[in-house]
Amino acid sequence: ILGGREAEAHARPYMASVQVNGEHLCGGVLVAEQWVLSAAHCLEDAADGKVQVLLGAHSLSQPEPSKRLYDVLRAVPHPDSRPDTIDHDLLLLQLSEKATLGPAVRPLPWQRVDRDVEPGTLCDVAGWGIVSHAGRRPDRLQHVLLPVLDRATCNRRTHHDGAITQRMMCAESNRRDSCKGDSGGPLVCGGVLEGVVTSGSRVCGNRKKPGIYTRVASYAAWIDSVLA
């Protein structure tokens, strides 16, 4: 997260760290007791690594009573996701067992009504992604509030030049932004999951390159079918 600040510890009990061989790779969001939603591209470089999900964490390195690492039983990328585009960039991870819920571990309700979030709405994005252009990784969860940007502006030739589909949304990126390592994490508006940080190699913190988020409401049928 660029231009953000340390989050209040355990105030986002839905927040997940998707890890490969014990290292944070991407964010994720607990959407059901045994399922974490993330971005499809996140695991492309996982290769033959051991994928696990950390729940109940604030610090990645320090012991915390609520922290628990879960093995992943199953990784389900959206059937239309593919390595060379950010379209349909969603992944569902089934944990090896149901998460133990508590004040620091709780699924987040996700948006089912397929309607655009009002431009200008302030939404919260959190993650353990880099906090500087130099690539510094934080140990503790960071967050930032970002205004939603209308799709027409986001699609300007100077911005994303028509790449933003109806199934995506944008947020402003003027020095405050999600960045590498935040992919797969949640964009939360009014206490509801609206978007998932896409995992392209976009430049971060440049106002001409707004953050791109996959709209979960647009994928309600797919999410329901996998979770069923």
Epitope: L43, E44, A47, D48, K50, R74
Partner: antibody
Framework: AVQLVESGGGLVQPKGSLKLSCAAS????????MNWVRQAPGKGLEWVAR??????????YYADSVKDRFTLSRDDSESMLYLQMNNLKTEDTAMYYC???????????WGTGTTVTVSS | DVLMTQTPLSLPVSLGDQASISCRSS???????????LEWYLQKSGQSPKLLIY???NRFSGVPDRFRGSGSGTDFTLKISRVEAEDLGVYYC?????????FGSGTKLEIK
């Protein structure tokens, strides 16, 4: 660029031995599972063997047709994959491809192959 | 071992036609983790095979959307909506769910 280059193929007599090598470049070799796939002249593809990464204890798996005759190994420090083939049979005659295996277990990078001919 | 039966062995088509290739496994190829590791590869003459589809229906990088994979359990299909000259070659299905992994026998897509 991501690349796999096989070598070590050639003509060998039945019951003989041969060691194939595969040099990997352009990616983090040590994190990937690697495979050999072969193709007999004018025939289809046949999976031969797979070796996993260090994080999966270098576990190996073999096709029944090569079990106990072929041994798969890797040297992560040199980004090399090896296939030691012993007690070769005429039916082992084929083009041997070195193949990288991605997270979703697909074969996403293939070498150009090296030819093994087993004949007296 | 899981036997992968591909039909037809040869598929003559006209450019612009739809092509459909079937692949049937001798047993379910759902892995113990719930995923189905069913892939489709295309091998053009004199070249190494190239990945087209993974996890039954996910298209790989650079694969045109005229290629579509579908199926479940033991029955799988690759459809090419409008065949182009560059699509000609031998198509193989492959299962990576159960060791030993197995390929189908191949389907040669050729011009009528």
């Amino acid at each position: 660029a991501v690349q796999l280059v096989e070598s070590g193929g050639g003509l060998v007599q039945p019951k003989g031995s041969l060691k194939l090598s595969c040099a990997a470049s352009g990616f983090s070799f040590n994190t990937y599972a690697m495979n050999w796939v072969r193709q007999a002249p004018g025939k289809g593809l046949e999976w031969v063997a797979r070796i996993r990464s260090k994080s999966n204890n270098y576990a190996t798996y073999y096709a029944d047709s090569v079990k106990d005759r072929f041994t798969l190994s890797r040297d992560d420090s040199e980004s090399m994959l090896y296939l030691q083939m012993n007690n070769l049979k005429t039916e082992d005659t084929a083009m041997y491809y070195c193949v990288r295996q991605g997270f979703y277990w697909y074969f996403d990078v293939w070498g150009t192959g090296t030819t093994v001919t087993v004949s007296s | 071992d899981v036997l992968m039966t591909q039909t037809p062995l040869s598929l003559p088509v006209s450019l612009g036609d739809q092509a459909s290739i079937s692949c049937r496994s001798s047993q379910t190829i759902v892995h113990s983790n719930g995923n189905t590791y069913l892939e489709w590869y295309l091998q053009k003459s004199g070249q190494s095979p190239k990945l087209l589809i993974y996890n039954v229906s996910n298209r790989f990088s650079g694969v045109p959307d005229r290629f579509r994979g579908s199926g479940s359990g033991t029955d799988f299909t690759l459809k090419i909506s409008r065949v182009e000259a560059e699509d000609l070659g031998v198509y193989y299905c492959f299962q990576g769910s159960h060791v030993p992994y197995t390929f189908g026998s191949g389907t040669k897509l050729e011009i009528k």
